[in-house]
């Protein structure tokens, strides 16, 4: 029977060129975690493995860096990251867990008053 | 970047053992992942065992659990892998290789992640 939850860090927003970290957390269960998985709709983003530690899927090993702890950091952000993100868990005994994230990259306001205005 | 000379391999009995060495020189093996690889006639290089520069962190296939001990000696800069009980089917090239993919605390042993490779040294266990 499978116990636990995942909480995440939820809808959260970040502006363009920023960086973001995506967090979850397992509870409430024993279960062993062997492996997370961070996904992006259907991309694999990053593998963190009990045995074998991290590995970042090569299209995003330039935007993308592990931690904190079982967390992944999203860095030089674009509007194309906005999206859903899911953390999986891979424990033992209970099975699979998984938690989403919902991220909103956001155009800079710098950017945004650059716009606007010029310089004389 | 890294350079790495292994060394240790040769011809031994079944139930034997043999300590292979990996000197490494251009950079310090402490902010490295170390591994060592086998690639037998026809098959797949595979990861044998691997460590993290600071020690704290071991990985072992499950063909030679409780057989071989991988260790790092930073002073020496140098990466061993003690082989005991080995078996026919240990024969094979063992290549030394290493990585520093991402930064303290983490760590990569994956086969992807390994950049710099030594030549190789051949183990043959003969029955």
């Known amino acids: 029977m499978m116990t636990g939850t995942i909480e995440t860090t939820g809808n959260i927003s970040a502006e363009k060129g920023g960086s973001i970290i995506l967090q979850c957390h397992l509870s409430s269960t024993t279960a062993q975690v062997t492996q997370v998985n961070w996904e992006q709709q259907d991309q694999l983003l990053a593998i963190c493995n009990a045995d074998l530690g991290w590995h970042i899927s090569p299209s995003f090993k330039d935007r993308v860096a592990p931690g904190p702890g079982l967390g992944l950091t999203l860095q030089s952000l674009t509007v194309n990251d906005t999206g859903e993100y899911f953390c999986i868990y891979h424990t033992y005994p209970d099975g699979t867990y998984t938690g989403r994230i919902f991220l909103e990259v956001l155009e800079s306001s710098v950017a945004e008053h650059g716009a606007r205005f010029q310089i004389p | 970047e890294v350079q790495l000379v292994e060394s240790g391999g040769g011809l031994v009995q079944a139930g034997g053992s043999l300590r292979l060495s990996c000197a490494a020189s251009?950079?310090?093996?402490?902010?490295?992942?170390m591994g060592w690889f086998r690639q037998a006639p026809g098959k797949e290089r595979e990861l044998v065992a691997a460590?993290?520069?600071?020690?704290?962190?071991?990985y072992y296939a499950d063909s030679v659990k409780g057989r071989f001990t991988i260790s790092a000696d930073n002073a020496k800069n140098t990466v061993y892998l003690q082989m005991n009980s080995l078996k026919p089917e240990d024969t094979a090239v063992y290549y030394c290789?290493?990585?520093?993919?991402?930064?303290?605390?983490?760590?990569?042993?994956?086969?992807?992640?390994?950049?710099?490779w030594g030549q190789g040294t051949q183990v043959t266990v003969s029955s």
């Open positions: 290789a290493a990585n520093r993919r991402y930064s303290f605390p983490y760590w990569s042993f994956w086969y992807d992640d390994f950049d710099y």
């Open positions: 460590i993290t520069g600071s020690g704290g962190r071991t």
């Open positions: 251009g950079s310090t093996l402490s902010s490295y992942a």
